[in-house]
Interface confidence: low
């Protein structure tokens, strides 16, 4: 099959780093500077990505692979292939339209990116707060007071189900 395909389509023999040049009897020509082809059989080479401004070059473009960008210090990548750079904030902050703002009470952010998230509600898991939360750190939940009292059962029976809108019988 490959042989037949090659005879029918001379371009399939062109390796990555070249393109099938129709202007030159479909011979494989090397990609010109600032362009690349990452797969064989291509009829054109793609223009290399340029890492400018807030982007900086993580990997140079080569004839077979595109340049890869990352972000200058103080920024971090967003999107596939680092398509955007977003400003870093400090831990305990989140990025808003007006810049970096401290997390509101009851929320935290332990990274330089992303949004402030609510502290874990320990009581939802039947636990108590062992270490208070801060802007930078979530609360640490510990065992519930009942778990610590002597003779307490380790298994709590479930409360009876109540349908909304109905009074207990």
């Amino acid at each position: 099959f490959e042989r037949t395909r090659s005879l029918q389509d001379p371009c399939s023999n062109c390796p990555a780093g070249t393109f099938c040049d129709n202007n030159r009897n479909q011979i494989c020509s090397p990609c010109p500077p600032n362009s690349f082809s990452s797969a064989g059989g291509q009829r054109t080479c793609d223009i290399c990505r340029q890492c400018k401004g807030v982007f900086r070059t993580r990997k140079e473009c080569s004839s077979t692979s595109n340049a890869e960008c990352d972000c200058t210090p103080g920024f971090h990548c967003l999107g596939a292939g680092c398509s955007m750079c977003e400003q870093d904030c400090k831990q305990g902050q989140e990025l808003t339209k007006k810049g970096c703002k401290d997390c509101c009470f009851g929320t935290f952010n332990d990274q330089k990116r992303g949004i402030c998230r609510p502290w874990t509600n320990c009581s939802l898991d039947g636990k108590s707060v062992l270490v208070n939360g801060t802007k930078e750190r979530d609360v640490v939940c510990g065992p519930s007071p009942a778990d610590l009292s002597p003779g307490a059962s380790s298994v709590t029976p479930p409360a009876p189900a109540r349908e909304p809108g109905h009074s207990p019988q």
Epitope: P30, P33, N34, G53, R56, T57, E60, S62, S63, T72
Partner: antibody
Framework: QVQLVQSGAEVKKPGASVKVSCKAS????????MHWVRQAPGQRLEWMGW????????TYADDFKGRVTITRDTSASTAYMELSSLRSEDTAVYYC?????????WGQGTLVTVSS | DIQMTQSPSSLSASVGDRVTITCKAS??????VAWYQQKPGKAPKLLIY???IRHTGVPSRFSGSGSGTDFTLTISSLQPEDFATYYC?????????FGGGTKVEIK
């Protein structure tokens, strides 16, 4: 034609700083990045860093971080490389080189001698 | 950092000889290799970039080949002005690194 003309030779004492200039002509200065490379006597070429001449953002080789500062003056089409805390092993010829898929044009070199 | 190892470190040849210099990268650098010529007391001059593309004004007797980790600079018929030191350099990743050089001397 493209030309890069560097400042003259310098003799410095250990601990001092040196600033080498590189004046570009024959092309649009901000269209190409400028790299700095040095060569100690009888040694291989050693890359020091480069500057994005459009934005002014420098990138330094790890071996020189904290000691080298690369800047540019677009109005004068000139790049600068300053090396501080000089020691005897910094004695070398320092080159600027325009970059276009490779270092395609080089300055004539500036000999910096560090001696007490 | 990527290491570029050139061989031989020096060679003696006569005018008209075919000369081959090799450069081996410590990891795949695709085709992102350049070759430079340097004469004593002078700045390097670019000969070849992207492994095989001759720079403007470089004579056709200079050719480059290779990809991945193995690269070759060939001078098809050595001329008197070709006696110099030749360096390879990868530009695939930062920092760009140079080979140790090959000195071509007159036999």
């Amino acid at each position: 034609q493209v030309q890069l003309v560097q400042s003259g030779a310098e003799v410095k004492k250990p601990g001092a700083s040196v600033k080498v200039s590189c004046k570009a002509s024959g092309y649009t200065f901000t269209d190409y990045s400028m790299h700095w490379v040095r060569q100690a006597p009888g040694q291989r070429l050693e890359w020091m860093g480069w500057i994005n001449t459009e934005t002014g953002e420098p990138t330094y080789a790890d071996d020189f971080k904290g000691r080298v500062t690369i800047t540019r003056d677009t109005s004068a089409s000139t790049a600068y490389m300053e090396l501080s805390s000089l020691r005897s092993e910094d004695t070398a010829v320092y080159y600027c080189a325009r970059y276009d898929y490779a270092m395609d044009y080089w300055g004539q070199g500036t000999l910096v001698t560090v001696s007490s | 950092d990527i290491q570029m190892t050139q061989s031989p470190s020096s060679l003696s040849a006569s005018v008209g000889d075919r000369v081959t210099i090799t450069c081996k990268a410590s990891q795949d650098v695709s085709s992102a290799v350049a070759w430079y010529q340097q004469k004593p007391g002078k700045a390097p001059k670019l000969l070849i970039y992207w492994a095989s593309i001759r720079h403007t004004g470089v004579p056709s007797r200079f050719s480059g080949s290779g990809s991945g980790t193995d690269f070759t600079l060939t001078i098809s018929s050595l001329q008197p002005e070709d006696f110099a030191t030749y360096y390879c350099q990868q530009r695939y990743t930062t920092p760009p690194t140079f080979g140790g050089g090959t000195k071509v001397e007159i036999k």
